[in-house]
């Protein structure tokens, strides 16, 4: 029947009978680094050029028999998923295949590096249109493989990779852990994360989004007209490579940062059953399933933002966590989160000419995460204003004093270790519009930006009764740029953004202690970009 | 996504006097050796030598040649399998792990990574 995966990635307005994929990725070349492929399969014949590149290790075992159909199985299927005539995502995309995996599906980091270099050389010798590189493979964490991916990405190439099939944190594998690569996890027809035997899809902060990856119909190397169903994060990555090819074909000037933000923006949100993931990974794992954009690829001028989590700081007393945006993105706010609630806040600082989001662990804490809100703001001029901690009992106020600059985020960082003596910081929209307000021993940081037509406002939501979390969402047309918690309890775990929702987390043990008068408030800064208007703070 | 994962990094700054060469005595290794945390995935004997970002094309070749020469003085044969110019400066080498200390002290070396397997997903 109609492949579930193609239906799933097709937005509802496309599902009408008249749907024909718009140009199907015809301006884009997709490089596939995988096994050998059966290039005369009806699905991909004339669409895939087999390059002369081959760098694979010997197959294991003395009695291993190279059976052509087995050698070609993985690569042929993926080529079909990307651009197959019948079951492909981007039916117009042309592909080039490089053999870096042997007949047993094994390759080496060095072979993959040489393959990536081959692509870079080809790009230098004969520059073509947009390039997508599909890496449906994974090994252990490799600094050099990640570095090579970074260099290729900075040369304008879009790299898409499998998150890995190890039911583990994707950050422990490469190239999945490379920040510049679009890392894809796998979901099934029921929007559940894919289980593969005793293992399954990888997860965590290094995954950018998920895509269909179970029972994916595609070209089989058993015969030139056969179809086979395969499962894995490779299949999921192939879907995203196809979607990327479609998007780049429609808008060839898209940068990697713009493409990633669009993939996130057009994804189906909050459809994955997160209970499958380990509890400590659920908050870090994006609840996003890739879909094609509606027929117009324009985002309607909407401000596009994503949330980037740092690695865990570790438990030492002075441990810090650092979250970074991509070079083209603006860091509009920084917050922090700690499962124990023992954190000393967050701030933005410049490292090597780039602003980064930092968070600091507190004495007795099990560690913190820094949470950056990274946005695409055309022609933005952003800066950080900070005020040292006020004397005990006094509030510290910071606002954006430059003309036409608006507040996009607030950060607070405490000098004192003792959590019991300080009242956590607050963000007040009613008394001081456009200001960050800190209390007792808090240094306050305001993120201030100027961009044509950028306007922002604060939205708050408080809960007095027992609650593990308080949320507030930005309304349609507005984008969440900043998220903070204004505590009513003695201990808050921090705040973070999930798509357009600001989530303020409260410590479990604090719930019983709370009196009805102490509301815990989630405070969101919501912004929008209206190019015709001038920058403004909305009351 | 940028911090190192579950990953082995070893400092192998061996005493520079060991080979008695004047130019080596002046260079103390600050480079690190890295390898896959999963032992079964490692490929000992093949190493990716990564040089500093600003290393020139000629210097890459000189560094590889220097490693071969110094290894030969110790009675080791080194095979340079590939030189990386276009994505990052470095080279791929087949050699005994005994030579890692020597390689880490070469000028321009940022780190050395042991080759490892990748798998179809």
């Amino acid at each position: 029947s109609i492949p579930w995966n193609l239906e799933r990635i097709t937005p509802p307005r496309y599902r009408a009978d008249e749907y024909q994929p718009p140009d199907g990725g015809s301006l884009v070349e997709v490089y596939l680094l995988d096994t050998s492929i059966q290039s005369d399969h009806r699905e991909i014949e004339g669409r895939v050029m087999v390059t002369d590149f081959e760098n694979v290790p010997e197959e294991d075992g003395t009695r291993f028999h190279r059976q052509a159909s087995k050698c070609d199985s993985h690569g042929t299927h993926l080529a079909g998923v990307v651009s197959g005539r019948d079951a492909g995502v981007a039916k117009g995309a042309s592909m080039r295949s490089l053999r870096v995996l042997n007949c047993q599906g094994k390759g080496t980091v060095s072979g993959t590096l040489i393959g990536l270099e081959f692509i870079r050389k080809s790009q230098l010798v004969q520059p073509v249109g947009p390039l997508v590189v599909l890496l449906p493979l994974a090994g252990g964490y490799s600094r050099v493989l990640n570095a090579a991916c970074q260099r290729l990405a900075r040369a304008g190439v879009v790299l898409v990779t499998a998150a890995g099939n190890f039911r583990d944190d994707a950050c422990l594998y490469s190239p999945a852990s490379a920040p510049e690569v679009i890392t894809v996890g796998a979901t099934n027809a029921q929007d559940q994360p894919v289980t593969l035997g005793t293992l399954g899809t990888n997860f965590g902060r290094c995954v950018d989004l998920f895509a269909p990856g179970e029972d994916i119909i595609g070209a089989s190397s058993d015969c030139s007209t056969c179809f086979v169903s395969q499962s894995g994060t490779s299949q999921a990555a192939a879907h995203v490579a196809g979607i990327a090819a479609m998007m780049l074909s429609a808008e060839p000037e898209l940068t990697l940062a713009e493409l990633r933000q669009r993939l996130i923006h057009f994804s189906a949100k909050d459809v994955i059953n997160m209970a499958w993931f380990p509890e400590d990974q659920q908050v870090l794992t994006p609840n996003l399933v890739a879909t094609l954009p509606p027929s117009t690829h324009e985002t309607g001028g909407q401000l596009l933002c994503r949330t980037v989590w740092s690695a865990h700081s570790g438990p030492t007393r002075t441990a810090t966590a650092t979250a970074r945006c991509a070079p083209e993105e603006e860091l509009l706010s920084c917050s922090s989160f700690s499962r124990s609630g023992r954190r000393r806040g967050d701030w933005i600082e410049a490292i090597g000419g780039q602003q980064v989001c930092k968070a600091l662990n507190a004495f007795g804490g099990e560690g913190v995460y820094a949470v950056a809100r990274c946005c695409l703001v055309p022609r933005a001029n952003c800066s950080i204003h900070n005020t040292p901690a006020a004397r005990a009992g006094l509030e510290t106020h910071v606002h954006c004093h430059q003309k036409d600059h608006v507040l996009t985020g607030c950060s607070f960082h405490w000098e004192v270790e003792d959590l019991s003596v300080r009242r956590q910081p607050a963000l007040r929209s009613r008394r001081q519009p456009g200001q960050c307000v800190g209390h007792q021993a808090a240094s306050v940081y305001a993120s201030c930006c100027h961009a044509p037509g950028l306007e922002c406002k604060i939205k708050e939501h408080g809960i007095s009764g027992p609650s593990e979390q308080v949320t507030v969402a930005c309304e349609a047309g507005w984008t969440l740029t900043g998220c903070n918690v204004l505590p009513g309890a003695s201990l808050t775990l921090g705040a973070y953004s999930v798509d357009n929702l600001c989530v303020a987390r409260v410590h479990d043990t604090a719930r019983a202690d709370r009196t009805s008068g102490e509301a815990t408030v989630a405070a969101a800064i919501c912004c929008r970009s209206r190019p015709s208007a001038k920058a403004s703070w909305v009351q | 996504q940028d911090e190192d994962g579950d990953y082995e990094e070893l400092m192998l700054a061996l005493p520079s006097q060991e080979d008695g060469l004047a130019d080596e005595a002046a260079h103390v290794a600050t480079a690190t050796f890295r390898r896959c945390s999963k032992e079964a995935w490692r490929l000992p004997g093949t190493y990716i030598v990564v040089l500093m970002e600003e290393t020139q094309r000629l210097q890459i070749e000189q560094t590889a040649h220097r490693l071969q020469t110094r290894a030969a003085r110790r009675g080791y044969v080194i095979k340079v399998l590939h030189i990386f110019y276009d994505l990052f400066p470095g080279f791929l080498v087949k050699m005994s792990s005994d030579l890692l200390g020597l390689a880490l002290k070469l000028p321009h070396v940022e780190y050395i990574e042991e080759d490892s397997f990748v798998f179809a997903q």
Partner: antibody, heavy 118, light 113 residues
């Protein structure tokens, strides 16, 4: 040799249960969806159920929904149909059929007869 | 559910003559994304399981003689046997696999006149 062999049919009373098996050989079982199709004596073909290659997705005809369960064991290369609350109208030859993965059936077993009668 | 209706119910044709069987679906089985009609034809000889002849409405399964051909699109389809042979005596079924539940036509019995 590429083949499917059904077993487990027989005579059962209304309200009873039966479990059909289908042993697959000669192809990569895990990579193909599998189906059960039945044919009442002297009648046409009637699709009963399908299961995806991974076993993660199943579909049933309305007439058997809630009574029949399709499953597969990838290690044994075997497809199953657990039939509960059987009715006289379930009497048929039950065929196991390999899916091309598009929903058409490119390999069939020889069938096993299920008779529901008191 | 998509209802499949075949005509005629039975057909007698002389050896060497052309046999034509029609199949109509209650809704289109053409998938625009790949421009394929999700329709197959099966042959079932007495005492045997069905055998796939045609898929995608017009593509012959490997090993099927070229006297068998399929045509049509959307909702109307035809199976043609260009020159009837004795071994073609069987019941022929069309099937839509556009969506579950998969449905078959009621069958057409082909005999020799």
């Amino acid at each position: 040799e590429v083949q499917l062999v059904e077993s487990g049919g027989g005579l059962v009373q209304p309200g009873g249960s039966l479990r059909l098996s289908c042993a697959a050989s000669g192809f990569t079982f895990n990579n193909y969806a599998m189906n059960w199709v039945r044919q009442a004596p002297g009648k046409g073909l009637d699709w009963v159920s399908t299961i995806s290659g991974s076993g993660g997705t199943t579909n049933y005809a309305d007439s058997v929904k809630g009574r029949f369960i399709i499953s597969r064991d990838s290690s044994k290369h075997t497809l199953y149909l657990q039939m509960n609350s059987l009715r006289a109208e379930d009497t048929a030859v039950y065929y196991c059929a390999k899916d091309s993965n598009w929903g058409n059936f490119d390999l069939w077993g020889r069938g096993t007869l299920v008779t529901v009668s008191s | 559910d998509i209802v499949m209706t075949q005509s005629p119910d039975s057909l007698a044709v002389s050896l060497g003559e052309r046999a034509t069987i029609n199949c109509k679906s209650s809704q289109s089985v053409l998938y625009r994304s790949n421009n394929r009609n999700f329709l197959g034809w099966y042959q079932q000889k007495p005492g045997q399981p069905p055998n796939l002849l045609i898929y995608w409405a017009s593509t012959r399964e490997s090993g099927v003689p070229d006297r068998f051909s399929g045509s049509g699109s959307g909702t109307d389809f035809t199976l043609t046997i260009s020159s009837l042979q004795a071994e073609d005596v069987a019941v022929y079924y069309c099937q839509q696999y556009y969506t579950t539940p998969y449905t078959f036509g009621q069958g057409t019995k082909l005999e020799i006149k």
